[in-house]
């Protein structure tokens, strides 16, 4: 397993509709054709997997059917969007990138993006 640098923004504020987007960029040492991206959430010293996708370079990211994440890739950048967020989902979202194929296997873990989500106060049919 070889290390790889992964960059992501320090802070992102989710929209009033509970949508947060950020870019995860990795410094690919070689010409990977298969990449796996995982988003982890760290809060209260607990780490949980939010979503994961494997993609072939040049193709769309494919998340599981029930995933709250969507994303697109462009070169060594992955644009990630997480939906349905509310205040209790505030936390540090860590981007983990694995270059699966061809060998050698590379692993990179970002420092995390602190996503802040605010619950709006009562108002006509606002998004919570």
């Amino acid at each position: 397993c070889k290390a790889m640098h992964v960059a992501q923004p320090a802070v992102v504020l989710a929209s009033s509709r509970g949508i947060a987007s950020f870019v995860c960029e990795y410094a690919s040492p070689g010409k990977a054709t298969e990449v796996r991206v995982t988003v982890l959430r760290q809060a209260d010293s607990q780490v949980t997997e939010v979503c994961a996708a494997t993609y072939m370079m040049g193709n769309e990211l494919t998340f599981l059917d029930d995933s709250i994440c969507t994303g697109t890739s462009s070169g060594n950048q992955v644009n990630l969007t997480i939906q349905g967020l509310r205040a209790m989902d505030t936390g540090l979202y860590i981007c983990k990138v694995e270059l699966m194929y061809p060998p050698p296997y590379y692993l990179g873990i970002g420092n995390g993006t602190q996503i802040y989500v605010i619950d709006p106060e009562p108002c006509p049919d606002s998004d919570f």
Epitope: R17, G18, R41, T48, E49, V50, D65, D66, S67, I68, T70, I82, Q83, G84, L85, R86, A87, M88, D89, G91, D119, P120, E121, P122, D125, S126, D127, F128
Partner: antibody, heavy 123, light 107 residues
Amino acid sequence: QVQLVQSGAEVQKPGASVKVSCKASGYTFTSYYMHWVRQAPGQGLEWMGIINPSGGSSNYAQKFLDRLTMTRDTSTSTVYMELSGLRSEDTAVYYCARDPPITMFRGAPFDYWGQGTLVTVSS
Amino acid sequence: DIQLTQSPSSLSASVGDRVTITCRVSQDISRLLNWYRQKPGEIPKLLIYRASSLQSGVPSRFSGSGSGTDFTLTISSLQPEDIATYYCQRTYSAPYTFGQGTKLEIK
């Protein structure tokens, strides 16, 4: 085990207020949102509002904005739903239901419901 | 106002039949939709969340699909205990509106 236990049935006169409680146990109270949903006799489900027991913030369906108040007491793990200006069409069974943060591992929204509280509005 | 329209509003089917209920939402909600079964005199029971995830303890004859604005609940082989009213609900953000319900009866 997870339980949401609601207060007993109420009979109120038009114009009065009713306050229904929902006591949670078997999980961390402040880690889940709580919703209130009602169902009039022979009718469908109607979402009323949501409260964050951690901070106390809430949001209500538009039709209840001027009459609904949702509060919580973290010391007793209880949420309250108060509906004022009661009219006959408010006669319904009122339910509380919990809802985890979407990023909670294996968390399913509205997985546990209270047993329901029948509120009858009659003169 | 956000609307959820279920169809049909009622249906009658035989034991063993494949039954499909649809839910159309007036705006894109990604996959954030629940399905419930409510038997007469009982509280609603969560069947499916995030459009296709089967809730723990729910029989595998229930399945959900769809995303965006069009969703489907399927019962692969109808059982007598499935006599109930079925509801869809958006969980994308407030308001967490329910569909009007689909009443399912056994022929």
